[in-house]
Interface confidence: medium
């Protein structure tokens, strides 16, 4: 009897949908795996007789529930199927947006770039999929614990009247208000303000 794959899960970030599993202990030799998806009531092969422990399902429709399954195989034997259900639009993790930060005197000018979606048009981003897409921005004075959160209305924001010659850190994440779903924070970007332009030099 061939044991089934273990720890079967979907690792999905920005609709890059990778079905992952672990190979069970099997004394007779190396196992191969076949992964399938349900399409119009028929299971279709996606990865056949692979020695890998993952299979890319990024081409699935983003909407609706998908049934995926994987089994282990050895020679003419095979394990039972292990099934999981996956809804990309609900289950994918929203990766961190990009952010460009520019210092102008005592202001930080920020531009946000929604995460790109692989296997789509070059310009296709998470914003194209989620109508309610918005950004959460948080910023703080470097070295302090107090954080300030804002929700920009657009793909850019300006933090004005900051303390001069002070380093501020900023990070951004995607947020879907209608789903109350937040994405991953970007890495903090820290920049030092310069002089206050209203002060004569």
């Amino acid at each position: 009897m061939v044991p089934p794959p273990e720890n079967v899960r979907m690792n999905s970030v920005n609709f890059k949908n990778i079905l992952q599993w672990e190979s069970p202990a099997f004394a007779k030799g190396n196992l191969t795996f076949t992964a399938q998806y349900l399409s119009y009531r028929i299971f279709q092969d996606k990865c056949m007789n692979t020695t890998l422990t993952e299979c890319d399902f990024s081409s699935l429709s983003k909407y609706g529930d998908h049934t995926l399954r994987v089994r282990a195989e050895f020679a003419d034997e095979h394990s039972d199927w292990v099934n999981i259900t996956f809804c990309p639009v609900d289950d994918t993790i929203i990766g961190p947006p990009g952010m460009q930060v520019e210092v102008l005197a005592d202001s930080l000018h920020m531009r946000f770039l929604a995460p790109k979606i692989e296997n789509e048009y070059e310009t296709w981003t998470m914003k194209n999929v989620y109508n309610s897409w918005t950004y959460n921005v948080q910023y703080w004075k470097n070295g302090t614990d107090e954080k300030f959160q804002i929700t920009p209305q657009y793909d850019f924001e300006v933090l004005r009247n900051l303390e001069p010659w002070t380093t501020y850190c900023v990070q951004v994440r995607g947020f879907l208000p209608d789903r109350n779903k937040a994405g991953e924070w970007s890495e903090p970007v820290c920049e030092q303000t310069t002089h206050d332009e209203t002060v004569p030099s």
Epitope: N11, V13, I94, G95
Partner: nanobody, 125 residues
């Protein structure tokens, strides 16, 4: 420098429950992932559970699925591990770990960048 403070370990009879807490301090950026791993004497480290703080998505090792629950309080930068129906084989030092990088939900927590000092959990039969 990130500091992690674990608490809630102790000794319990088989079938009992414990709740571990892990608080992140001394870091100004928000945590993306928090998790727990454990190490028993003479055994390899084992990832136990992880949580993505954004959506609250969770992932568990097969050995604890259905018995352990990971949760988080983002406002307090704290993660919790509720451990029910404990077994003697759950005896180990439990470590909290956090990371600020992306795409780590299915990685064992011992691969995370920052780890705590650990708290002992002992389950007797």
């Amino acid at each position: 420098q990130v500091q992690l403070q674990e608490s809630g370990g102790g000794s319990v009879q088989a079938g009992g429950s414990l709740r571990l807490s892990c608080t992140v301090s001394r870091y100004t950026a928000s945590v993306n992932y928090m998790g727990w791993f454990r190490q028993a004497p003479g055994k390899e480290r084992e990832g136990v559970a992880t949580i993505f703080t954004g959506a609250g998505t969770t992932y568990y090792a097969n050995s604890v699925k259905g018995r352990f629950t990971i949760s988080r309080d983002n406002a307090k930068n704290t993660a919790y591990l509720q451990m029910n129906s404990l077994k003697p084989e759950d005896t180990a030092i439990y470590y909290c770990a956090v990371d600020f990088r992306g795409g780590l939900l299915y990685r064992p927590a011992y691969e995370y960048t920052y780890r705590g000092q650990g708290t002992q959990v002992t389950v007797s039969s």
